[in-house]
């Protein structure tokens, strides 16, 4: 029995619903009474959802899963996962048994966009060219871990003297803090780009230092 799932991971935003696609080819005369379907977590073997003897056996996964009952008879064994959480990320295996059996695994990649970075400067007054300043770029509640890039006003990458830390909160979402230590020129713009590698989403923040006062676009 051939069971088919998408080759590419299913990407789902935190808090939204995701469909893990799984299909099989029913033979002529197939009835749902013959179908045994099991969804489980690939690594831990934890039961997620099942269907047996013509009956949906329900969710064993925090009551957040559902099948598509009207589509099962056509060979659609897809699973709906509601209110996706970071902890849901991973591989799910779809096992289908009629007379023969088959299985295939589909990956769920969870993502959350990062907030627009906030920029802070230390010290933030009485700045002169030649002073060393610390610029902090902070972006919140994203997933997975971000890539952080700094550049100056001419678009030249700034890679030295950068320290980036990422801390997960209780939901598994990351708060990113990136610190750039730089010696001030006569004036200048310093930009921070926080990239979500899964969503290919960039969040920009910048600070422009022009003697007195400074501006934070």
């Amino acid at each position: 029995l051939e069971v088919q799932v998408p080759e590419d991971p299913v990407v789902a935003l935190v808090g939204t619903d995701a469909t893990l696609c799984c299909s099989f080819s029913p033979e002529p005369g197939f009835s749902l009474a013959q179908l045994n379907l099991i969804w489980q977590l690939t690594d831990t073997k934890q039961l997620v959802h099942s269907f047996a003897e013509g009956q949906d056996q329900g969710s064993a996964y925090a009551n957040r899963t559902a099948l598509f009952p009207d589509l099962l008879a056509q060979g659609n064994a897809s699973l709906r996962l509601q209110r996706v959480r970071v902890a849901d990320e991973g591989s799910f295996t779809c096992f289908v048994s009629i007379r023969d059996f088959g299985s295939a695994a589909v990956s769920l990649q969870v993502a959350a966009p990062y907030s627009k970075p906030s920029m802070t400067l230390e010290p933030n007054k009485d700045l002169r060219p030649g002073d060393t300043v610390t610029i902090t770029c902070s972006s919140y509640r994203g997933y997975p871990e971000a890539e952080v890039f700094w550049q100056d006003g001419q678009g030249v990458p700034l890679t030295g003297n950068v320290t980036t830390s990422q801390m997960a909160n209780e939901q598994g979402l990351f708060d990113v803090h990136s610190v750039l230590r730089v010696v001030l020129g006569a004036n200048g713009t310093y930009s921070c780009l926080v990239r979500n590698p899964v969503l290919q989403q960039d969040a920009h923040g910048s600070v422009t230092i022009t003697g007195q006062p400074m501006t934070f676009p």
């Epitope: 029995l1 045994n36 099991i38 003897e53 096992f95 048994s97 023969d100 059996f101 088959g102 299985s103």
Partner: antibody
Framework: DVQLVESGGGVVRPGESLRLSCAAS????????MSWVRQAPGEGLEWVSS????????LYADSVKGRFTISRDSSNNSLYLQMNSLRAEDTAVYYC??????????WGLGTLVTVSS | EIVLTQSPGTLTLSPGERATLSCRAS??????LAWYQQRPGQTPRLLIY???SRATGIPDRFSGSGSGTEFTLTISSLQSEDFAVYYC??????????FGGGTKVEIK
Amino acid sequence: DVQLVESGGGVVRPGESLRLSCAASGFTFSSYAMSWVRQAPGEGLEWVSSISGSGGSTLYADSVKGRFTISRDSSNNSLYLQMNSLRAEDTAVYYCAKARNNFFDYWGLGTLVTVSS
Amino acid sequence: EIVLTQSPGTLTLSPGERATLSCRASRSILTSLAWYQQRPGQTPRLLIYGANSRATGIPDRFSGSGSGTEFTLTISSLQSEDFAVYYCQQYYDWLTITFGGGTKVEIK
């Protein structure tokens, strides 16, 4: 008439390997899942492993996972069980069985595997 | 895994008597249960599947009943060839198939 004939059993030492075979006839071999079920001397039946009709999916009992490998060859209607790192508790008669909806409608006569030092 | 408990371990009866064998599942398996007969020195033979459907060629003195967690195999009138060991098997959790420990039906 469905026929299942196992071979390859014998006496081995702990840690050694053995490969069992099952020759199937009398049905469309590639359309059915196949399984191995074992029975230790004087004991009950224990499911060991199953393989889908295409050979693309396999299932194993926890007691043999990582040590045993089930496979099949539809060109010669044969089922196999490669058994590595054998232990004394693997001593049993090994039956090849044709699966239908995950129960077993036809069984072979079995082949005896003895693991002893 | 689903544990199947068969009782009694041994049933001693005379030919012509009725035999009632029990199989209890540790959790509901709906009707995903099969029964097998194994005569001494022989291979197992499928008797019942789906808790109550007789396999091809099985005499009608064999019948199965039950659903959920409680199942029964009944042999209405024991024949000499029925003295054997009987096993139940669940396939509700077909990723981890399990058998009961068996009931031996012996001649009184």
